[in-house]
């Protein structure tokens, strides 16, 4: 049986199937209090109106309470991410109550039917919370609903129906089909909890978007633009065009939200930061690495509630696996002049050298044309912590090797057969670290020699005036 939510075509088919005839009464939603990290342990099933299981199972009324809500499934068995999330929560919050909301019987349906069941499941959770609120010391402010995919919208309904306001809802790639563009009362929204944070990892502007594209929380984080996740390509997932490849890619990207959240729980010392930006393209240009006015935040469990923020879109890059943290840099390169460039688009490569480590050679992604006699901004990121930057090596090549660009290059060469050599003139590079918020200017090692031909290298060192620190501190200090 294929994994949930995939392949895309299969889900598309599901959406157009007629409603199945229900021959038996649907079983109720079950609440399993995971009293042990041991997966073999049966846990305790909580029952509305029955206080004995709460006492028998050591439900801690004053502690945080997590409700984990799974999504639609094409299988009758829990998916593997659930164990990882429960275990991570137990590790991070040792005294907390971790409750698994088992609505498999209602989720293991046609997708449209499962969607129609989200409301009733949300209502069940709300009733459980209302009952718990009658107990001494239990506070709705300590409740954190964590919903994956369709489960994120279930959490939204629960937050909407409960008497009072739950402390937090985390939406892990909330489902897109039948929720995109829906009214706020029919999907997860910022009104559903005191703080609603959302991770979007499988959004598509073309074809079927498994995850919802629109912002639905107080903060909406789009790792890697919210679409193509590193390590989830066809080659990464199976290495060959075997059966179920597309299914695996869908599962990998959709489920990445869960693993990013797990990462934030277990790798507390390696927090990932996201940066507020109006759109993905602007972020890719490197112009959104500011932490001023609460424009950056930790992702996942460590996210901080921002006052007066709603539908704030935030972006970051990540590694392909845990720990997902990368180090973001904004690079501003002023190209003073082109020499004999014809129609060739340059592609820049930098290597960063730091006190802790050196980076690999990193390509600077061109979002728009390189402008001459203008400052061009780029985003680069490294998987390792380089420490304080010491020097930068810059190289460039002609256009990327597409057939069109090869033709352009050949045409340019033929039109200028005696081309004396293409050159760019770059005198300095300004760098800002997203993680530390430090700004530095790097000057050409040889101020008399700032022209660079394709394949040649130019070295830049910290300028004499060295560390140009603005009144911006590290996000770890600044975040509320």
């Amino acid at each position: 049986s294929p994994t949930p939510f995939g392949p895309e075509g299969q889900l598309a088919d599901e959406l157009h199937k007629p409603k199945a005839i229900q021959t038996e009464v649907k079983p109720s939603v079950r609440f399993n209090l995971r009293t042990s990290k041991d997966p073999e342990h049966e846990g305790c099933y909580l029952s509305l109106g029955h206080s004995q299981p709460l006492e028998d199972c050591g439900f801690n009324m004053t502690a945080k309470t997590f409700f984990i809500i799974h999504g639609w499934t094409m299988s009758g068995i829990f998916e593997n991410w659930l164990h990882k999330l429960v275990s991570a929560l137990h590790t991070r919050e040792k005294d907390a109550n971790v409750v698994v909301v088992d609505w498999l019987p209602l989720a293991h349906q046609l997708y449209t039917d499962a969607v129609n069941n989200t409301r009733v499941v949300g209502h069940s959770i709300a009733r459980m919370l209302d009952w718990l609120q009658e107990k001494d010391d239990f506070s709705l402010g300590n409740v954190h609903l964590i919903g994956y995919s369709l489960g994120a919208h279930v959490a939204g309904y629960a937050g909407n129906f409960v008497k009072g306001t739950v402390g937090r809802i985390t939406g892990l790639d909330p489902a897109g089909p039948m929720f995109e563009g829906a009214d706020i009362h029919k999907r997860l929204s910022p009104d559903d909890a005191d703080f609603v944070d959302v991770l979007h990892t499988y959004t598509r502007s073309f074809g079927l978007s498994i995850g919802i594209q629109m912002p639905v929380g107080h903060i909406d984080i789009y790792p890697n633009g919210g679409d193509f996740q590193p390590g989830c390509g066809l080659n990464d997932v199976l290495g060959s065009m075997a059966y179920g490849t597309i299914t695996e890619v869908v599962k990998c990207e959709h489920e990445r939200a869960v693993h990013l959240f797990v990462d934030s729980l277990v790798n507390q010392d390696k927090p990932s930061f996201a940066f507020q930006c109006t759109d993905s393209n602007r972020f890719k240009k490197g112009i959104c690495l500011s932490c001023r006015k609460n424009r950056c935040n930790s992702i996942g469990y460590n996210a901080k509630k921002m006052r007066n923020k709603r539908n704030s879109k935030m972006y970051l890059k990540t590694r392909a696996g845990m720990p997902f943290r990368v180090y973001h840099y904004q690079m501003k390169i002023h190209v003073f002049s082109y020499k004999n460039m014809g129609e060739i688009e340059p592609t820049f490569y930098v290597t960063l050298y730091g006190t802790n480590a050196d980076s690999q050679t990193l390509p600077l992604e061109i979002v728009e044309r390189i402008e001459q006699n203008a400052t061009n901004t780029f985003l680069v990121y490294t998987e390792e912590d380089l420490g304080d930057l010491l020097k930068i090596q810059l190289t460039w090549e002609g256009a990327s090797q597409s057939w069109y660009n090869l033709w352009k290059e050949l045409r340019s060469y033929l039109s200028q057969p005696h081309n004396p050599g293409r050159e760019l003139n770059i005198r300095r590079i300004r760098v800002k670290s997203g993680e530390t918020q430090r700004k530095l200017t790097f000057c050409a090692e040889d101020p008399e020699n700032t022209s660079i031909s394709p394949g040649r290298e130019l070295w830049f060192r910290k300028c004499r005036d060295g560390w140009r620190m603005k009144n911006e501190t590290s996000p770890t200090v600044e975040l509320p």
């Epitope: 049986s1 294929p2 994994t3 079983p27 079950r30 399993n32 995971r34 997966p39 073999e40 342990h41 049966e42 846990g43 099933y45 299988s75 009758g76 068995i77 829990f78 593997n80 659930l82 164990h83 990882k84 088992d102 498999l104 019987p105 293991h108 390590g231 990464d236 997932v237 199976l238 290495g239 695996e248 599962k251 696996g321 845990m322």
Partner: antibody, heavy 119, light 107 residues
Framework: EVQLQQSGPELLKPGASVKISCKAS????????MHWVKQSHGKSLEWIGG????????TYNEKFKDKATLTVDKSSSTAYMELRSLTSEDSAVYYC????????????WGQGTTLTVSS | DIVLTQSLATLSVTPGDSVSLSCRAS??????LHWYQQKSHESPRLLIK???QSISGIPSRFSGSGSGTDFTLSINSVETEDFGMYFC?????????FGGGTKLEIK
Amino acid sequence: EVQLQQSGPELLKPGASVKISCKASGYTFTDYTMHWVKQSHGKSLEWIGGINPYYGGTTYNEKFKDKATLTVDKSSSTAYMELRSLTSEDSAVYYCAKGDYYGGSYNYWGQGTTLTVSS
Amino acid sequence: DIVLTQSLATLSVTPGDSVSLSCRASQDISNSLHWYQQKSHESPRLLIKYASQSISGIPSRFSGSGSGTDFTLSINSVETEDFGMYFCQQSNSWPYTFGGGTKLEIK
């Protein structure tokens, strides 16, 4: 004490069908998934599929989707696997195994049911 | 499907030796790997779950390690009762799959 008691050996002709049973005791039957595993003579193990006894939801290995059907009888805490259109390739030992809460690992196994398909 | 490779089909050891059995996954499976021992004409027995979690009733000489794609089952000072087949199994994604097995035999 958790126990999984499987039905006895079967000798059947090609084309026939068989229903193997696995009676569970010592735990709450509906709280854990039940899985079925095939082991051909001298070979490794192959996961056939699993069932959630709470409501009968199943998941299958694509390879066995047209071969096996998993069911449960909650009243007797028994899981069943029916194998149809038998061929000599289906000759093997079949095990039922109790999954953990998440259905991932199998701490308890039945004693195995030997199926021989021969004309 | 995720392929689990147990590179050594047979491992010959002397009682008292310490051994390591390896299992490699064709893609990242995090810690969703379990180890089983099977003796002739017996059902498999769970030794280690989720890469490194011990099982009650299993001797402490058995331990597991690894994450991602490379996993190891270690037996500290092998005893005669430890000889038999060892299988790894992944539960990261369906279909769940088993390795081909490593036979631990007396040298």
